[in-house]
């Protein structure tokens, strides 16, 4: 492979580790938009045990933007020395390099959910993966928030255990005949950023206190 | 060497506030988180939070949310800290340091005095 | 938080005697990824905080061997073999395995 000097410097490059349904993920994307490299291959090291740059290999030669690094990037202490290079066939565009702790770093992304309305309740039904690694629960709480009207109001489930499989939960002491929006995300213990889901909206079925407890049955 | 070289003493009125820089020297300020420590006189110390000065992302800790922004400005090496809406529970020594991991703090700056008084 | 508890408070010590300083903390240190983030430093008066000893037990580059660290799970152990004019000062634990990290209160080692 022919190493020509590369055009862009490790500023040429964003970055961004998401926790998406529980797999880390790393995107990127370039600034200069003028060069467009056919594949990349994603590279890494950990600073703590500075060996030689290890090949991920599920990111060797790929056309996508993104990789998965579940399975390679356990530590929420460690450093990931990181590099990216692009090609254009053989030809090696560019290099770009940056550090990654977790603990940082990592942006969390709301679970995929479901509503269902009830003439006074709606069942949210929040999806999770079957097995979630307890280094990937990162101290995280779920967060359920119903619109109404312009009144927000924040519902947070105890989650038993960690957050895996299906969960259900029950909004409920709601008016019949209203519009209610709910929208899902998962809230750190630092209170960092969140990522809120779009809302998801539902007309709650007029009807009696009684009609609805049958169709909850 | 790896060196952290702080601003000076500040003397602040309640109500204000002070940006505390930490300059990095001797190694790639980028490869390694900047963390902040507060040390009250005669007290022990008391985590801040950290920067990636690569990435701009911060953590800190709970006790400090509204109090404190953490920045870093890649082209000079440097790292900040604001402190806002200063009371004299805010005199204190404060102290950065240099982190490989998470909570290394293997360098530090030799403090910052921050006195709160009207 | 991971509430760190450092005994005794002040260790009044004769010069080329032994020390010994214990950090116990509310919680195991021990992370999931099998390390164990326990790290000593200590603060000479007026100066700011030098790191000694980081993952329980790994001395710092340039730092005598007169300093040992050892412990697992919730009680650790900084020992000096024989303490010299340069030790003096006040030390602290902190554990680095739960956010946010936390510091000991600080044992104070001084001249009997």
């Known amino acids: 492979i022919s190493y020509d000097s590369p055009d862009y410097t490790d500023e040429s490059c964003t970055f961004k580790i998401s926790l998406r349904n529980f797999r880390s993920i790393l995107s990127w994307e370039l600034k200069n938009h003028s060069i467009v490299p056919t594949h990349y291959t994603l590279l890494y090291t950990i600073m703590s045990k500075p060996e030689d740059l290890k090949v991920v290999k599920n990111c060797a030669n790929t056309t996508r933007s993104f990789c998965d690094l579940t399975d390679e990037w356990r530590s929420t202490h460690e450093a990931y020395v990181t590099v990216l290079e692009g090609f254009s066939g053989n030809t090696t565009l560019f290099s770009c390099s940056h550090n990654f702790w977790l603990a940082i770093d990592m942006s969390f992304e709301p679970p995929e959910f479901e509503i269902v309305g009830f003439t006074n309740h709606i069942n949210v039904m929040v999806k999770f993966p079957s097995i979630v690694e307890e280094e990937l629960q990162f101290d995280l709480s779920l967060v359920i928030e119903e619109q109404s009207e312009g009144i927000v109001k924040k519902h947070k489930p105890e989650i038993k255990g960690n957050m895996s499989g299906n969960f259900t939960y029950i909004i409920d002491k709601l008016i019949p005949n209203t519009n209610y929006c709910v929208s899902v995300y998962l809230e750190h213990s630092d209170e960092q950023a969140v990522i809120k889901s779009p809302l998801k909206c539902t007309l709650l079925p007029p009807g009696q206190e009684s009609e609805s407890a049958e169709s909850a049955k | 060497q790896v060196q952290l070289q702080q601003s000076g003493v500040e003397l602040v009125r309640p109500g204000t506030s002070v940006k505390v820089s930490c300059k990095a020297s001797?190694?790639?300020?980028?490869?390694?988180?900047i963390e902040w420590v507060k040390q009250r006189p005669g007290q022990g110390l008391d985590w801040i939070g950290m920067?990636?000065?690569?990435?701009?992302?911060?953590k800190c800790n709970k006790k400090f949310k509204g109090k404190v922004t953490l920045t870093a400005d890649k082209s000079s090496s440097t790292a900040y800290m604001h402190l806002s809406s200063l009371t004299s529970d805010d005199s204190a020594v404060y102290f950065c340091a240099r982190s490989g991991w998470v909570y290394a703090m293997d360098y530090w700056g030799q403090g910052t005095s921050v006195t709160v008084s009207s | 938080d991971v509430l760190m508890t450092q005994t005794p408070l002040t260790l009044s010590v004769t010069i080329g005697q032994p020390a010994s300083i214990s950090c116990k903390s509310s919680q195991s240190l021990l992370d999931s990824d099998g390390k164990t983030y326990l790290n000593w430093l200590l603060q000479r008066p007026g100066q700011s905080p030098k790191r000694l000893i980081y993952?329980?037990?790994k001395l710092d580059s340039g730092v005598p061997d007169r300093f040992t660290g050892s412990g697992s799970g919730t009680d650790f152990t900084l020992k000096i073999s024989r303490v010299e004019a340069e030790d003096l000062g006040v030390y602290y634990c902190?554990?680095?395995?739960?956010?946010?990290?936390?510091f000991g209160g600080g044992t104070k080692l001084e001249l009997k």
């Open positions: 001797g190694y790639a300020f980028t490869n390694y988180l």
């Open positions: 920067i990636n000065p690569g990435s701009g992302g911060t």
């Open positions: 993952l329980v037990s």
């Open positions: 902190w554990q680095g395995t739960h956010f946010p990290q936390t």
